[in-house]
């Protein structure tokens, strides 16, 4: 297993609709044709998997149907979007990239993107 550098933004603020997007960029040592991307959430020193997708280079990322993630790839960049976020989902979201093919196997883990989610204030009752 060889190490690989993965870059991602330090901080992202989710939209009022609970959507956060960030770019995960990896320094591929060669031309990888099968890549696995995983988003992990670290909060209170606990790590959980948020979503994962394996894609063949040139094809779209395919997450499971019930995944809260969507994404697109372009070269060595993956544009990730996480939906349905609430304030309690605030945490460090780590991008992990694995180059499965061709060999050798490479693993890269980013430093994480701190995603802040602020629940919108409820609209005040209106007399109109």
């Amino acid at each position: 297993c060889k190490a690989m550098h993965v870059a991602q933004p330090a901080v992202v603020l989710a939209s009022s609709r609970g959507i956060a997007s960030f770019v995960c960029e990896y320094a591929s040592p060669g031309k990888a044709t099968e890549v696995r991307v995983t988003v992990l959430r670290q909060a209170d020193s606990q790590v959980t998997e948020v979503c994962a997708a394996t894609y063949m280079m040139g094809n779209e990322l395919t997450f499971l149907d019930d995944s809260i993630c969507t994404g697109t790839s372009s070269g060595n960049q993956v544009n990730l979007t996480i939906q349905g976020l609430r304030a309690m989902d605030t945490g460090l979201y780590i991008c992990k990239v694995e180059l499965m093919y061709p060999p050798p196997y490479y693993l890269g883990i980013g430093n994480g993107t701190q995603i802040y989610v602020i629940d919108p204030e409820p609209c005040p009752d209106s007399d109109f």
Epitope: C1, T33, E34, R36, L40, V47, T48, E49, A52, T54, M56, I94, K96, E98, M100, Y101, P102, Y105, L107, I109
Partner: nanobody, 119 residues
């Protein structure tokens, strides 16, 4: 605990076939690059064949066209179909799983199964 259990080894004559199987823990199989390595007496362990989760395969030149690696994700099992066996294929064959789980990388090997090709 992750376990890789190989089976299917044995003694065969040159030109015959064998199929090796390796059953893996469900928790890692579908996300692992699965491979077969072999080690002959007095030699270094060498990669024979590998298969990715997406089904991409690689073979060492000496087995190309004779060996076929495949995986059954429903059974968490990887296979090595070995045809036209030669005496130089004699070795202990090891199943390998490589990948990462959460933030930890892993590189597991099974106990090995002996393949002997002799007349």
């Amino acid at each position: 605990e992750v376990q890789l259990v190989e089976s299917g080894g044995g003694l065969v004559q040159p030109g015959e076939s064998l199929r090796l199987s390796c059953a893996a823990s469900k928790s890692i199989f579908s996300i692992s690059v699965m491979a077969w390595y072999r080690q002959a007496p007095g030699k270094q362990r060498e990669l024979v064949a590998r298969i990715t989760p997406g089904g991409n395969t690689n073979y060492v030149d000496s087995v190309q066209g004779r060996f076929t690696i495949s995986r059954d994700n429903a059974k968490n099992t990887v296979y090595l179909q070995m045809n036209s066996l030669k005496p130089e294929d004699t070795a202990v064959y090891y199943c390998n799983a490589q990948g990462s789980l959460l933030l930890a990388k892993y590189d597991y090997y099974g106990q090995g199964t002996q393949v002997t090709v002799s007349s």
